[in-house]
């Protein structure tokens, strides 16, 4: 997987005035990074794995970037036309990727009132739009702005792709966070569902990166995907992820029933608990 | 005694139809996921279709996905398998057979049957 | 799908020899894993799950070991009546056979 920083800003307008305050928010490697509030920007990081990405540092430069960007946006949807009365918003998603092979990828994508409009490969210079007239009448809207505004030329571009290459690579030196692997804590629970039956699930957290194989098996067999229920694969606010699988078993046949989970070449088999024990937690080295 | 016994084999055109059963007896069937696994002549092991214990998981290999169904009976005790627009290739003797509900199972199966011969052939 | 490949497809040992038999899954199966023996005419007998877990009632002469890719079942020390066909089987990904080997008397 390639390591990736992201940048999502969002400006609002209320009745055709833009709002003064934006919101950013930065993910680094698919986990929340760093975030600026509404009325004022100040970079915070998103728990201590991103405190820990360059130490005691002053979020200052981050801070100033951020902001800058976040008025480069605000003026772009003041020249959004087909403002109608009530709440509006635009939203700005710059992602950069550093692959394996230490080829990169950049591009910028404009999403107006959470629908996507306009995207930009950052390298090519490409320009990319949905077939719809909407999308297209926004499109033509803001390309035209930012042909016009001087700030926003082919040398903006390069150097935002520049720009978060650079800082993308500044925060993978620190290699605290990034290319780590930690284990999932796996542990399963019961509860009584309808008569005869009950739900075993299977919680997985605490896991980096986020790749994991959940499942349920019966005698070692997986249960087909329509006899389990999953949940997403979500951050948990500490730089790592959780997840869960659940069925539906009779109650009696506990034994015959275990979790498999595998994450980054480890694997480990979790068995329900009996009755009595609601919980059990076994942690694989 | 624990036992499978398969039935319903024989020789049959290509393009027909055939319906094999297994009946169980020596141990309570409906605790158990059941196979269908057959063996051409002369030749290894193919697994052919999975049922679980109560029916809600059912598997089958890609050379009979869409024209063979598996289902079972808990209540007669049998495991069946409809065979649809049957092939040349698909002349086996075909067995059922239980899977394993020892603790730490990895999907084995323990009791098989003695067989039942699929001729087809025009 | 996961494919079972197992060698030697047959080999010629004489009573008393150690016997080794490979099986080799197309990608990761952990350690789902079985083995069986069969003779002609008859129908397969369980032997081995979870790679190396001895069915009750197989001689200790029977062993498996392995995880992941690569599998062995061996025969300490053959007899008369182990000359037979022995496949390996996954359950990882559905569930599929090796091709068999087939161990014959020199």
């Known amino acids: 997987e390639p390591h990736s920083l992201r940048y999502n800003l969002t400006v609002l307008s209320w009745d055709g005035s833009v709002q003064s305050g934006f919101l950013t928010e930065v993910h680094l490697d698919g986990q929340p990074f760093l975030r600026c509030d509404r009325q004022k920007c100040r970079a915070k990081p998103q728990g201590q794995w991103a405190e820990d990405v360059l130490g005691n540092k002053t979020w200052d430069r981050e801070t100033r970037d951020l902001t800058g960007n976040g008025k480069d946006l605000r003026m772009t949807l003041a020249h959004i036309k087909d403002q109608k009365e009530g709440l509006h918003s635009l939203q700005e998603i710059r992602v950069c990727e550093i692959h394996e092979d230490n080829s990169t990828r950049s591009s910028q994508h404009f999403y107006y009132d959470g629908e996507l409009f306009l995207s930009q490969n950052l390298e090519t210079k490409e320009w990319t739009m949905p077939q719809s007239s909407r999308a297209q009448t926004l499109a033509m809207n803001v390309r035209n702005f930012l042909k016009e505004d001087a700030m926003k030329t082919k040398t903006h571009y390069h150097a935002m792709h520049a720009d978060c290459l650079q800082e993308l690579r500044r925060y993978l030196k620190s290699g605290v966070v990034l290319r780590r692997t930690v284990p999932p804590m796996v542990n399963v629970t019961r509860s009584e569902a309808s008569e005869g039956n009950i739900t075993v699930t299977c919680r997985a957290s605490g896991f980096y990166p986020w790749n994991i194989t959940l499942s349920w098996r019966q005698d070692g067999v997986s249960l087909s995907h329509d006899t389990q229920q999953w949940g997403d694969v979500l951050p948990d606010g500490n730089g790592t992820y959780q997840t869960w699988v659940a069925t539906r078993i009779c109650q009696g046949e506990e034994q015959r029933f275990t979790c498999y989970m595998e994450h980054s070449g480890n694997h480990s088999t979790h068995p329900v608990p009996s009755g009595k024990v609601l919980v059990l937690q076994s942690h694989w080295q | 005694e624990v036992q499978l016994v398969e039935s319903g084999g024989g020789l049959v055109q290509p393009g027909g139809s055939l319906r094999l059963s297994c009946a169980a007896s020596?141990?309570?069937?409906?605790?158990?996921?059941m196979n269908w696994v057959r063996q051409a002549p002369g030749k290894g092991l193919e697994w052919v279709s999975y049922?679980?214990?109560?029916?809600?998981?059912?598997y089958y290999a890609d050379s009979v996905k869409g024209r063979f169904t598996i289902s079972r009976d808990n209540a007669k005790n049998s495991l069946y398998l409809q065979m649809n627009s049957l092939r040349d290739e698909d002349t086996a003797v075909y067995y059922c057979?239980?899977?394993?509900?020892?603790?730490?199972?990895?999907?084995?199966?323990?009791?098989w049957g003695q067989g039942t011969m699929v001729t087809v052939s025009s | 799908d996961i494919q079972m490949t197992q060698s030697p497809s047959s080999l010629s040992a004489s009573v008393g020899d150690r016997v080794t038999i490979t099986c080799r899954a197309s990608?990761?199966?952990?350690?789902?894993l079985n083995w069986y023996q069969q003779k002609p005419g008859k129908a397969p007998k369980f032997l081995i799950y979870?790679?190396?877990s001895l069915q009750s009632g197989v001689p200790s002469r029977f062993s498996g070991s392995g995880s992941g890719t690569d599998f062995t079942l061996t025969i300490s020390s053959l007899q008369p009546e182990d000359f037979a066909t022995y496949y390996c089987?996954?359950?990882?990904?559905?569930?599929?056979f090796g091709g068999g080997t087939k161990v014959e008397i020199k």
């Open positions: 049922i679980s214990s109560s029916s809600s998981t059912i």
């Open positions: 990608q990761s199966i952990s350690s789902y």
């Open positions: 979870a790679a190396s």
């Open positions: 020596g141990f309570t069937f409906s605790r158990y996921s």
């Open positions: 057979a239980r899977v394993s509900v020892i603790t730490g199972n990895t999907g084995a199966f323990d009791i």
């Open positions: 089987q996954q359950s990882y990904s559905i569930l599929t």
